[in-house]
């Protein structure tokens, strides 16, 4: 149930993002973000996930890249880039590891 | 209950390498989950974080210091240590090992802290 | 990088409430934590992720935090609570811990 928060073995990720407590934070898995809203510059946020892992399958758009992954700071130089304005019709999504 | 025990010698000559141990007991430093954490307190001063590291060797430098720190751990001695390279008079404080809590990393046990002096 | 600032000094008379403030771009978005240090001693944790308490530590020490401005309050004061205050978030952009540089509560 992707509403419901794991309850699996805690991962330790790398957090990048201003709501971080400090330099890593535990979940059940890591996550990238990279978002561009309207008009600013592309922002890169690294964290732990523990709700709605089918983010994860999100295929990139031009303006949201979400990226998973299930080891110890894996996500720690992990870089995304964001799909171009007109995306390949059959470009797959990803569930990193 | 957790206790920290910083060691080292008390003074230093400007230039030199000051180095310091903190020993843990009452908690393994491999197993719990958490990282180790040096704080400095120059005298009549404010607290100035040092840096973090975990027992696998992961670390964490105070930007302004980093490329005069190296940290380490020993697990078999339920260790972890600080060096500090080509110290100066400014380097003179309280020198704290810490432990910061699980995910909120808040500093929640603490060594007593000693005074290293820099000098001639 | 992220500055702190906190007023070096606050005074109250005992019984009162002692209000200590953190001021900090947007602290609101961080979590702020509180020390307690009394001459010659190590730091105690006095509040954490805001307005938590540690286990020990009397109901009369609550925190907050919003805006550009985190409060640690003791309600009650008692002459045991002279000390040097510290708060202390984890800044992202320059990947350190940041201190405030104090304040000292005097109990008249």
């Known amino acids: 149930d992707p509403v419901k928060p794991s309850r699996g073995p805690l991962v330790t990720c790398t957090c990048e993002s201003p709501h971080c407590k400090g330099p890593t934070c535990r979940g059940a898995w890591c996550t990238v973000v990279l978002v561009r809203e309207e008009g600013r510059h592309p922002q890169e946020h690294r964290g732990c996930g523990n709700l709605h892992r089918e983010l994860c399958r999100g295929r990139p758009t031009e303006f949201v890249n979400h990226y998973c992954c299930d080891s110890h700071l894996c996500n720690h130089n992990v870089s995304l880039v964001l799909e171009a304005t007109q995306p390949p019709s059959e470009q797959p999504g990803t569930d990193g590891q | 209950q957790v206790q920290l025990q910083e060691s080292g010698p008390g003074l230093v000559k400007p230039s030199q390498t000051l180095s310091l141990t903190c020993t843990v007991s009452g908690g393994s430093i491999s197993s719990s989950g958490h990282y180790w954490s040096w704080i400095r307190q120059h005298p009549g001063k404010g607290l100035e974080w040092i840096g973090y590291?975990?027992?696998?060797?992961?670390?964490y430098y105070n930007p302004s210091l980093k490329s005069r720190i190296t940290m380490s751990v020993d697990t078999s001695k339920n260790q972890f240590s600080l060096k500090l390279s080509s110290v100066t008079a400014a380097d003179t404080a309280v020198y704290y090992c810490a432990r910061p809590k699980l995910d909120d990393w808040a500093l929640d046990y603490w060594g007593q802290g000693t005074l290293v002096t820099v000098s001639s | 990088s992220y500055v702190l600032t906190q007023p070096p000094s606050v005074s109250v008379a005992p019984g009162q409430t002692a209000r200590i403030t953190c001021g900090g771009n947007?602290?609101?978005?961080?979590?702020v934590h509180w020390y307690q240090q009394k001459p010659g001693q190590a730091p105690v944790l006095v509040v954490y992720n805001d307005g938590d308490r540690p286990s020990g530590i009397p109901e009369r020490f609550s925190g907050s935090n919003s805006g550009n401005t985190a409060t640690l309050t003791i309600s009650r004061v008692e002459a045991g609570d002279e000390a040097d205050y510290y708060c202390q978030v984890w800044d992202s952009s320059s990947a350190r811990v940041v201190f405030g540089g104090g304040t000292k509560l005097t109990v008249l």
């Open positions: 590291i975990y027992y696998s060797g992961d670390t």
């Open positions: 947007n602290i609101g978005s961080k979590t």
